[in-house]
């Protein structure tokens, strides 16, 4: 079984063959980059191999925990102004909104 | 158990679309996310996509582009589309119920519905 925070991806009929960090945080868990403008900025979702920056939760029971470089799991570009920046990974700021 | 039933599979040539559809009058679908799995005969069962409440979306990456996963909470059900298919697309294509509790102990095809068949031929 995978750990909490985390989802099957690959599975046989018992099993689990590859678990992935869950991809899309809790929405009550979602965190949002502090001092950012809110009018004409975006930032890039997390590359692939991190993981959503969930607060622990009742609904996920803890933080994702790390996973491996071939993580398969792609951010929709629909949904990646929505989608929380993982600290440990750089980040890449356009702003118009000076 | 809860039961969802999928449609709109079907058999189609390489290169054209298919819409499939996932409802249940059980229970109503604001609340959990979905997800979509996959398992072509003989395979494993593969996460294809996601939708949460507030329609965020993720995609494997082998459908990136190509599929798009969406909700009508009003209707009770999910939805996926399915442009550009390819012969590797041919599978049995399952909904699953709040993955991110469910679908964590392993198999997550073929437990809320019958799933709905694609076959795409070149």
């Known amino acids: 079984e995978c750990r909490p925070g985390m989802i099957c991806a690959t599975s046989a009929t018992n099993s689990c063959a590859r678990c992935v960090p869950y991809p899309i945080c809790a929405a009550e868990t979602v965190t949002k980059p502090q001092d950012m403008a809110e009018k004409d900025t975006t930032f890039e979702a997390p590359p692939l191999g991190t993981q959503p920056d969930c607060n622990p939760t009742p609904e996920n029971g803890e933080a994702p925990a790390s996973t491996s470089p071939t993580q398969s799991l792609l951010v929709d570009s629909q949904a990646s102004k929505t989608l929380p920046i993982p600290t440990s990974a750089p980040v890449a700021l356009s702003s118009t909104g000076k | 158990q809860m039961q969802l039933v999928e449609s709109g599979g079907g058999s189609v040539q390489a290169g054209e679309t298919l819409r499939l559809s996932c409802t249940t009058s059980?229970?109503?679908?604001?609340?959990?996310?979905m997800a979509w799995y996959r398992q072509a005969p003989g395979n494993e069962c593969v996460l294809v996509s996601i939708?949460?409440?507030?329609?965020?979306?993720y995609y494997a990456d082998s459908v990136k582009g190509r599929f798009t996963i969406s909700r009508d909470n009003a209707k009770n059900t999910v939805f996926l589309n399915l442009n550009s298919l390819q012969p590797e697309d041919t599978a049995v294509y399952y909904c699953?119920?709040?993955?991110?509790?469910?679908?964590?102990?392993?198999?997550?095809?073929?437990?809320w519905g019958p799933g709905t068949q694609v076959t795409v031929s070149s």
């Open positions: 699953a119920l709040d993955p991110r509790k469910n679908c964590r102990g392993g198999y997550c095809c073929a437990n």
């Open positions: 059980a229970f109503t679908f604001d609340g959990p996310d």
């Open positions: 939708i949460s409440a507030d329609g965020r979306t």
